[in-house]
């Protein structure tokens, strides 16, 4: 990536890292308003299976691993990207490496959920306070989960699907910060590991993933009021280990693996019409990216 100054624009979709033949250090940003991609400052260490989030206008890259010809190292790293300076800086690392991690943000705190370190599949969860640059463990999940989808709705943290080391999962659970406890919620209709999970219009969406046999293109959403999962329109491409985010009332899914190919496809879901459309292509196919959107 280039080290020049990034244009000072809002509402970009950032995609960090990923995997194609080896872990990648790319940071690129898509501007849905004009369909352009920006090539930004590379991650300091290549990473796939990471997660991305934004707090206070800064982009954070959390966990993952560096799978390279020189070896394979799971990451406990937290790195912070400043869009104004187009520079990365390291923050305090997590207590353990977490590959195929999920993250969510509540009240400006980053929650790092599950993931793996070697053959260990974590149920542990830790919270990062940016103002103190500190991580602290919170209550562990009821289930070990890697390839877990994480989303925040009404200040509650949801962990959806994943892989416990033996089975791919359709189960989901919810963390209550005030009580520091997890509770199971209604299971999805479909087993999904490596799904894209996000929140749109008071619903939690789970898109794609892998059911232990095949990549999926199906999408379902959880209504917290009725506590039910309902299918919506399927994506055009089957994909697992995809990136997902919400931008201006629409869901964007980026890349992933379809069982044969590393996808460069970016699809967009319009909830008003219940349709998916191909909106752009990434500069190259990849799986296991970290994705987030800058705040206004």
């Amino acid at each position: 990536g280039s080290m020049g100054h990034a244009p000072k624009v809002g509402r970009l979709i950032y995609t960090a890292g990923g995997y194609f033949r080896q872990s990648l250090s790319y940071l690129e940003a898509y501007n849905p308003s004009d369909g352009t991609w920006l090539d930004l400052a590379d991650l300091q260490v290549p990473r796939s299976g990471l997660a991305g989030c934004v707090v206070g206008g800064l982009l954070y890259a959390v966990g993952g691993r560096n799978n390279s010809p020189d070896g394979n190292t799971d990451s406990s790293a937290l790195d912070c990207y400043n869009p104004m300076t187009n520079q990365w800086s390291p923050c305090a690392p997590m207590s353990v490496p977490r590959n195929r991690i999920g993250v969510g943000v509540i009240d400006g705190h980053i929650y790092a959920v599950g993931g793996s370190h070697g053959c260990i599949h974590h149920n542990s969860v830790e919270r990062y306070e940016p103002e103190r640059d500190e991580w602290h463990l919170v209550a562990p999940m009821l289930t070990r989960r890697i390839g877990v989808g994480v989303a925040v709705l009404n200040r509650l943290l949801y962990a959806v699907g994943g892989f416990d080391g033996t089975n791919r999962l359709n189960s989901a659970e919810c963390y209550y910060p005030e009580r520091n406890e997890w509770r199971m919620i209604t299971a999805m209709n479909t087993i999904r590991s490596g799904a894209g999970v996000c929140v749109l219009h008071n619903c939690i969406y789970a898109a794609g993933g892998y059911d232990g046999q095949d990549q999926l293109n199906s999408v379902e959403r959880y209504d917290v009021e009725t506590e039910t999962w309902t299918f919506v329109a399927p994506m055009k491409h089957r994909r697992s280990a995809l990136g997902i985010t919400v931008h201006q009332g629409r869901i964007y899914v980026l890349g992933g693996y379809d069982g044969h190919t590393f996808l460069d496809s970016v699809e967009c879901y319009d909830p008003d019409t219940d349709t998916w459309s191909e909106v752009t292509r990434m500069t190259s196919g990849r799986s296991g990216v970290g994705v987030a959107v800058t705040m206004e």
Partner: antibody, heavy 120, light 107 residues
């Protein structure tokens, strides 16, 4: 019944290439990570490579990284090991293997092996 | 890489004997250790996974145990079909590594 059958071994000169196949039956190759493990004549076992069906990620032993490529074709239910720039020390029986239905990275299912001899 | 040091490299025993093979990991591998049996010209067969779990179909005379970074495979009463080479394997961290093997021969 789960079965793995390797083929493609043979005699090749140093610097040459070979592609090994691992045909699976009794399960979908998309349902489990596939590994290659080798055993030099009279020696022990060495893990070589693996492919993850969920993420597409591949892993390699340092001794083969950059020379060997693991892949899978789900339509043929077959995994492959493309071996380039072969060296004498790559001479071995090559096994494909997959884990069992439990939470461990140990190998419950093995093929019968195919012998690769690298010699001039 | 984690080294798995297996001992002894060979042993002679009689049918009915109790046989113990050990494997020491160069660093912590939790319980992510498996044991295999291999006969000449054949593929290895899984006996034990997760240090002490007996794989389906394996006779109960085989057992595994762990003490810290030391792992033990025990054959409680050696049978004629047990004469073979045995390998340990760690899968705790990348890359997975095997012990050098223990050949169990007839005394």
């Amino acid at each position: 019944e789960v079965q793995l059958v390797e083929s493609g071994g043979g005699l090749v000169q140093p610097g040459g290439s070979l592609r090994l196949s691992c045909a699976a039956s009794g399960f979908a190759i998309s349902a489990s990570s596939i590994h290659w493990v080798r055993q030099a004549p009279g020696k022990g076992l060495e893990w070589v490579a693996s492919i993850d069906p969920e993420t597409g990620e591949t892993l390699y032993a340092k001794s083969v990284a950059g020379r060997f490529t693991i892949s899978a074709d789900t339509s043929k239910n077959t995994a492959y090991l493309q071996m380039n720039s072969l060296r004498a020390e790559d001479t071995a029986v090559y096994y494909c293997a997959r884990r069992g239905d439990y939470g461990s990275w140990s190998f419950a299912y093995w093929g019968q092996g195919t012998l690769v001899t690298v010699s001039s | 890489d984690i080294q798995m040091t297996q001992s002894p490299s060979s042993l002679s025993a009689s049918v009915g004997d109790r046989v113990t093979i050990t494997c020491r990991a160069s660093q912590s591998v939790s319980s992510a250790v498996a044991w295999y049996q291999q006969k000449p010209g054949k593929a290895p067969k899984l006996l034990i996974y997760s240090a002490s779990s007996l794989y389906s179909g394996v006779p109960s005379r085989f057992s595994g145990s762990r003490s810290g970074t030391d792992f033990t495979l025990t054959i409680s009463s050696l049978q004629p079909e047990d004469f073979a080479t045995y390998y340990c394997q760690q899968s705790y961290s990348f890359p997975s590594t095997f012990g050098q093997g223990t050949k169990v021969e007839i005394k």
